[in-house]
């Protein structure tokens, strides 16, 4: 079952009997109108569809649209990753993929995009409902994360389509600064438009491109056909969670905190191309315990239910959840 | 979503001492790594310099042991790199970041903007 997503290809009118001087002056409305259209392009899209063999399988779709190399990949369901969501897949690009129950496959499709594919029976399955996020850090961007989940109404075998939803993923002065800039601009180009009345409106064709990435990890789609995807963003809420949330803890023990303060919406600037980063040589890092950390691909050792990075003053029942629920 | 905030950079003789600390805010984190990362301008990649997860395994890079402390804050959302007998080699950009463990490794999924340090002879 392919899913065909609708993506509007911008095409800047023919330049007709106009001179030099008159497509000259097009450019800059074509740039702008260009920005415009783009500037609210999401950097994560979520997919996810429930298989029509069987009601309790589902496959999570996600993809990032940023030009940065990607160093990791989330997928949780429940909620954002941190924010009382439970992790099912951890994809690091070069050292391997962790996975936890009821994820079943979790794999690359290509460089910028993944798939994982959920299974369970009874309380570990996902309700038809349930949020699921996928939060990809990359460099330089930083990282972001958008969540999607089924329709109520959707049947067996259909999926929704992409759904991109950032969730706190901006610098407020960084979004303020380009909102303003992009809306001078806007106007300007409306200005412009105004003025060019006679001449033909820009024409959006829809393209139909398949979001169906072959199973080996190809190369990422050109900077050109990512900026092109333009969906409505779409924030889904959910009462539905798995009963079973603390089963599908990826650790064993609470998280590194349970809730922090608050602070403005910030995405982090990333130092350096983590996904081109080689895995390090044995020698350079030394252990201080014996104990090994979990292979990749393994479940990571099980830590008791005090033994956290941060512990709360306020007691076990602080920390409660198992990634910290807000 | 996790914001992190470094401080305590700084210029520094060799053989001195310096404190970085990482305060954490926002979104609960769910990853189960944390630590410090460095980069020196003109390097291609960052290099580990310690890093902690979430059952008290810490581990260090063999240019640093037993030079560099890090440790978290009892109760508050905060992790230390204490650096003493700091040398001129290790002037860098210091960053704070949160991730997953993979192999033995701590991969970065939120790191901060960096704090940097520079140790003259």
């Known amino acids: 079952m392919r899913t065909e997503a609708q993506v509007p290809a911008l095409q800047p009118p023919e330049p007709g009997l106009e001179g030099a001087m008159g497509h000259r002056t097009l450019v800059l409305p074509w740039v702008l109108l260009t920005l415009c259209v783009t500037a609210g392009t999401p950097e994560v899209w979520v997919q996810v569809r429930m298989e029509a063999t069987e009601l309790s399988s589902f496959t999570i779709r996600c993809g990032f649209l940023g030009s940065g190399s990607i160093s990791l990949v989330t997928v949780s369901w429940g909620g954002p990753n941190g924010a009382g969501g439970t992790t099912l897949a951890v994809l690091h690009p070069e050292r391997g993929i962790r996975q936890w129950a009821p994820a079943r496959q979790a794999r690359w499709e290509t460089q910028s995009s993944i798939s994982l594919i959920l299974e369970g029976s009874g309380a570990s399955s996902p309700c038809a409902n349930t949020t699921f996020c996928c939060k990809f850090a990359s460099f330089p961007e930083g990282s972001w994360e958008a969540c999607g989940s089924l329709p109520p109404s959707s049947d067996p075998g259909l999926s929704a389509p992409p759904t991109p939803a950032p969730i706190l993923r901006a610098d407020l002065a960084g979004i303020l600064g380009v909102s303003g800039v992009l809306l001078f601009g806007c106007v300007y180009l409306l200005h412009l438009l105004r003025r060019h009345k006679h001449r033909p409106a820009p024409r959006l064709q829809p393209s139909r491109t398949s979001p169906q990435a072959p199973r080996a990890r190809a190369w990422a789609p050109s900077q050109a056909s990512q900026a092109a995807l333009h969906v409505p963003y779409a924030t889904i809420n959910t009462s539905c969670r798995p009963a079973t949330l603390d089963t599908a803890h990826p650790h064993g023990g609470p998280s590194w905190w349970a809730s922090l303060p608050t602070h403005a919406a910030h995405r982090p600037q990333g130092p350096a191309a983590w996904a081109s980063t080689p895995i390090p040589a044995r020698g350079s890092f030394v252990s201080v315990e014996n104990g090994l950390y979990a292979q990749a691909g393994e479940r990571p050792p099980h830590t008791g239910p005090g033994l956290t990075l941060f512990p709360d003053p306020r007691g076990p029942r602080a920390m409660e959840g198992p990634l910290g629920v807000r | 979503h996790v914001q992190l905030v470094e401080s305590g950079g700084g210029s520094v003789q060799a053989g001195g001492s310096l404190r970085l600390s990482c305060e954490a805010s926002g979104y609960s984190y769910s990853g189960d790594c944390m630590g410090w990362f460095r980069r020196a301008p003109g390097k291609e990649r960052d290099e580990g310099v310690a890093t902690i997860d979430n059952a008290g395994r810490i581990k260090y890079a063999d240019s640093v042991k037993g030079r560099f402390t890090i440790s978290h804050g009892n109760g508050k959302y905060i992790l230390y790199l204490q650096m003493n007998s700091l040398k001129p080699e290790d002037t860098d950009m210091y960053y704070c970041?949160?991730?997953?463990?993979?192999?033995?490794?701590?991969?970065?999924?939120?790191w901060g903007q960096g704090t940097q340090v520079t140790v003259s002879s």
């Open positions: 970041a949160a991730g997953w463990t993979f192999g033995g490794n701590c991969s970065p999924a939120d």
